[in-house]
Interface confidence: low
């Protein structure tokens, strides 16, 4: 492979490897690898492995997320599980004979133990294991809102399945709201989608750990498969660094246009179709703010500079641990135009024309 | 601004401007600007301006979309409107006395006129103008499926509003399916969300051009505000190039790992924590496929090479019309790890660790 000068493939790999070294430490806010002196012998505890697998499965089932990430998202997230309040609790009494819904209650003090402050929560998922089923059903999820009211959160069309399968609902906003309130019991309702015409509004889907016990329920003895919240949060001690002076800036028009930033930033550029391109054929708009990205993204050697100060720079200058980080567009927007083909005016949309923000990548 | 060598800011701007020249022509698949000889005098037709504004408003209300784009998405999209079948049509007779829903029917031959082939459709939105309302209501959209059945498409929580406002539903899949069928009448149902408990399942939301006429209906005389489909499609003549040999490849692991691509591509790199980093403190996983991006992204001068062949290269090598395109990650994935702090095992998720695909940006 060659660009202008010959690329030393081994050197690129070495630089990438060393960048990853710094990246991982920096994401964990560690100045050096933690001591292994106190690690107990033997395999990992089963609960830890189960949690690790939940997290890994979540990754497998998701598409990549190239959204601009807030500063806190750069850092590692601690993953915890909060099980729903036990079904024997009196709070479930009133819900027993309702055929269209099942209910899951959670103790917010358990959640607060895992996430002491609402802004630390990065993601919360409600996980339910659905048992095998031969029917298709449209289901809905609600949040307990006030004494007798429920707020709609989302829906899913569940097709028949031969094996138990996990359902996952993003409930980050709900859990963050609970953390903003006092301690207490909060809950979700999982319901059949009730049709305006239909008479049969029974929930046919069975959830492990809630629906009446059947042979074949998997591992309910171990509590592993009853509904739970999967929480991802920035640990409190790591969060204290987030508001320090060396924070990750959004390299967007708000920041870049009003600063004298020498490093990677979005630079202002207005294209006037007539003046800049000598074009009269685009009728609307007359021009647009195209902008462009410019500025260095220094490569940071983590080998000879294993200090917190240097590691903090990864976040801004090389968050992807690239062997040669580059200043490129992050958020782009489309541009609609009006032009003529012969006598016929056309409206067309051009994708990714306007650079809104940049990043080192 | 300086990187290793001083950057000539004016030259960068000039290169960006010339890149945009090539970019726009290339997106429109034009070898040169279209002739203006036949353009009628006077202002743009009102319907064209309304359509342009619809498109521009759609852009204003949306966040940037940094998703990997299929090849067809690179090119410009022609925008058209298809109005719903007139309310006086006999097809609406059966639906008049239903209080929980309103119905909107469309003639697929009108849609086919705008989009001759299903794959050309890039996006279809159902646009409804809701009249001012003092109530909050949870509404749902359904697609006509067979004679008497309706398929759920989506929902919206509509809060009170003092002014009429446009609602937009993405119905791309539905419209594409209609185009795959024969000509005929197809429809949508806009319904109250019927609760399992509630007795009042009446639709309180009023839609311009459907709900009983009230003073204050805006511009129904001009038909501008009755429900319509906003369609974005690749014009037929532009589409014929899409399957040519010089197509835009996904620079992902599937393609790059099995090819000898010299230009920008994702390159294979497995990090073994122990061997590569000398680390024993990460217990799971033992390593991961980090990968990296490498290879040139040639800058294309559009000034002296205004030919279709060269313009086609923009799509692969410089889709963002950058002054200095760079090979960078496109799709990234997180990595969950298990490690110990003292005696306490921790599961943490590290964002953007695995490079799945690259792009010239």
């Amino acid at each position: 492979l060659s660009t202008c000068k010959t690329i030393d493939m081994e050197l690129v790999k070495r630089k990438r490897i060393e960048a990853i070294r710094g990246q991982i430490l920096s994401k964990l806010r560690l100045a050096s690898p933690p001591s292994q002196g106190e690690v107990p012998p033997g395999p990992l505890p089963e609960a830890v492995l189960a949690l690790y697998n939940s997290t890994r499965d979540r990754v497998a089932g998701e598409s990549a997320d190239p959204e601009p990430e807030p500063e806190a998202d750069y850092y590692a997230k601690e993953v915890t599980r909060v099980l729903m309040v036990d079904r024997n609790n009196a709070i479930y009494e009133k819900t027993k004979d309702i055929s269209h819904s099942i209910y899951m209650f959670f103790n917010t003090s358990d959640i607060r133990e895992a996430v002491p402050e609402p802004p630390l929560l990065s993601r919360a998922e409600l996980r339910l294991q659905r048992l095998k089923s031969s029917v298709e059903q449209h289901v809905e999820l609600y949040q307990k809102y006030s004494n007798n009211s429920w707020r709609y959160l989302g829906n899913r069309l569940l097709t028949p399945t031969d094996t138990p399968e996990w359902l996952s609902f993003d409930v980050t906003g709900v859990v963050r709201a609970w953390l903003n309130q006092g301690d207490g019991i909060q809950g979700f309702r999982f319901s059949a989608h009730c049709s305006c015409d239909s008479k049969d509004n029974k929930l046919h889907v069975e959830i492990n750990g809630i629906s009446p016990k059947r042979r074949g329920d998997l591992g309910t003895i171990h509590d592993m498969n009853r509904p739970f919240l999967l929480l991802m949060a920035t640990p409190l001690e790591r969060a204290q660094h987030l508001h320090s002076s060396r924070h990750r800036r959004a390299l967007d028009t708000n920041y870049c246009f009003s600063s004298t930033e020498k490093n990677c930033c979005v630079r202002q550029l207005y294209i006037d179709f007539r003046k800049d391109l000598g074009w009269k054929w685009i009728h609307e708009p007359k021009g647009y703010h195209a902008n462009f990205c410019l500025g260095p993204c220094p490569y940071i050697w983590s080998l000879d500079t294993q200090y917190s100060k240097v590691l903090a720079l990864y976040n801004q200058h090389n968050p992807g641990a690239s062997a040669s980080p580059c200043c490129v567009p992050q958020a782009l927007e489309p541009l609609p135009i009006v032009y003529y083909v012969g006598r016929k005016p056309k409206v067309e949309q051009l994708s990714n024309m306007i650079v809104r923000s940049c990043k080192c990548s | 601004l300086s990187t290793c060598k001083t950057i000539d800011m004016e030259l960068v701007k000039r290169k960006r401007i010339e890149a945009i020249r090539g970019q726009i022509l290339s997106k429109l698949r034009l070898a040169s600007p279209p002739s203006q000889g036949e353009v009628p005098p006077g202002p743009l037709p009102e319907a064209v301006l309304a359509l342009y504004n619809s498109t521009r408003d759609r852009v204003a209300g949306e966040s940037a979309d940094p998703e990997p784009e299929p090849e067809a998405d690179y090119y410009a999209k022609e925008v058209t409107r298809v109005l719903m079948v007139d309310r006086n049509n006999a097809i609406y007779e059966k639906t008049k006395d239903i209080s929980h829903s309103i119905y909107m029917f469309f003639n697929t031959s009108d849609i086919r006129e705008a989009v001759p082939e299903p794959p050309l459709l890039s996006r279809a939105e159902l646009r409804l103008q809701r009249l001012k309302s003092s109530v909050e209501q949870h509404v749902e959209l359904y697609q006509k499926y067979s004679n008497n059945s309706w398929r759920y498409l989506g929902n919206r929580l509509l809060t009170p509003t003092d002014t009429p406002e446009w609602l937009s539903f993405d119905v791309t899949g539905v419209v594409r399916a209609w185009l795959n069928q024969g000509d005929g009448i197809q429809g949508f149902r806009f319904s109250a969300h019927c609760s399992c408990d509630s007795k009042d399942n009446k639709l309180h939301v009023e839609i311009n051009g459907i709900s009983p006429k009230r003073r204050g209906d805006l511009g129904t005389i001009h038909d501008m505000n009755r429900p319509f489909l906003l369609l974005m499609a690749t014009p037929l003549e532009r589409a014929q190039h899409l399957h040519s040999s010089r197509h835009r490849r996904a620079l992902d692991t599937n393609y790059c790992f099995s090819s000898t691509e010299k230009n920008c591509c994702v390159r294979q790199l497995y990090i073994d924590f122990r061997k590569d980093l000398g680390w024993k403190w990460i217990h799971e996983p033992k390593g991961y496929h980090a990968n990296f991006c490498l290879g040139p992204c040639p800058y294309i001068w559009s000034l002296d090479t205004q030919y279709s062949k060269v313009l086609a290269l923009y799509n692969q090598h410089n889709p963002g019309a950058s002054a200095s395109p760079c090979c960078v990650p496109q799709a990234l994935e997180p990595l969950p790890i298990v490690y110990y702090v003292g005696r306490k095992p921790k599961v943490e998720q590290l964002s953007n660790m695995i490079v799945r695909s690259c792009k010239c940006s």
Epitope: S146 | G61, E165
Partner: antibody, heavy 120, light 112 residues
């Protein structure tokens, strides 16, 4: 830290005009609806106007409709209130306030206020 | 007259519990719209105490709580302290008015 700083108040004669500004920082301005609220001397709070996050929708109290115009410049993180045809009953401290969530009409951050006095 | 009705003044001794009420109608509080409570200390800008009827804003002590029933909203302060002496306003979106938003007339709370 979220900050809203009003400016542009002062003494003006009846029938005159003033333009108030509100500079925002510490949050993504373009993601939130913002409002003007006023408080006449010794009186309670009175909602004046609201502009949506993108600046597309604007709403005004009946008392100011047709005389006041609210606008925003998301590039400059600034909110404006153009007040024309001022009356003595417009005398008040004018606060700008940000929505807690996009357009919730719950004001989780307020400016310090700017005094507008309409008097001959 | 304000669409949301509050008592103009109330008083309480330190340590006591006081409840400030705000009465509306089905077009505002009863309609399920976001209801908030604000505290205005003398000479300062108002501050959000409670949002969505019963949620404490960040940094607000848990002595303050909100509730709502039908057309009536309440703000309760337990363990009253001298620094709680202030004006308290309720506010809510109102769907019947072209104005859109209304504040109560305010309650002046004096700590004896």
């Amino acid at each position: 830290e979220v900050q809203l700083v009003e400016s542009g108040g002062g003494l003006v004669q009846p029938g005159g005009s003033l333009r108030l500004s509100c500079a925002a920082s510490g949050f993504t301005f373009s993601n939130y609806g913002v409002h003007w609220v006023r408080q006449a001397p010794g009186k309670g709070l009175e909602w004046v106007s609201h502009i949506s996050a993108a600046g597309i929708s604007r709403y005004y109290a009946d008392a100011v409709k047709g005389r006041f115009t609210m606008s925003r410049d998301n590039g400059k993180n600034t909110l404006y209130l153009q007040m024309n045809g001022l009356k003595s009953e417009d005398t008040a401290v004018y606060y700008c306030a940000k929505d807690r969530i996009r357009s919730s009409y719950e004001y989780d951050s307020w400016g310090q206020g700017t005094q507008v006095t309409v008097s001959s | 007259l304000p669409v949301l009705t509050q008592l103009s003044s109330m008083s309480g001794s330190p340590g006591q519990t006081v409840t400030i009420t705000c009465t509306g109608s089905s077009s505002n509080i009863g309609g399920g719209y976001y209801l908030s409570w604000y505290q205005q200390l003398p000479g300062t800008a108002p501050k959000l105490l409670i949002y969505n009827a019963n949620n404490r804003a960040s940094g607000v002590p848990n002595r303050f709580s909100g509730s709502k029933s039908g057309n009536l909203a309440s703000l309760t302060i337990t363990g009253l302290q001298a620094e709680d002496e202030a004006d308290y306003y309720c506010g809510c979106y109102d769907s019947s008015l072209s104005t859109g938003y209304v504040f109560g007339g305010g309650t002046k709370l004096t700590v004896l």
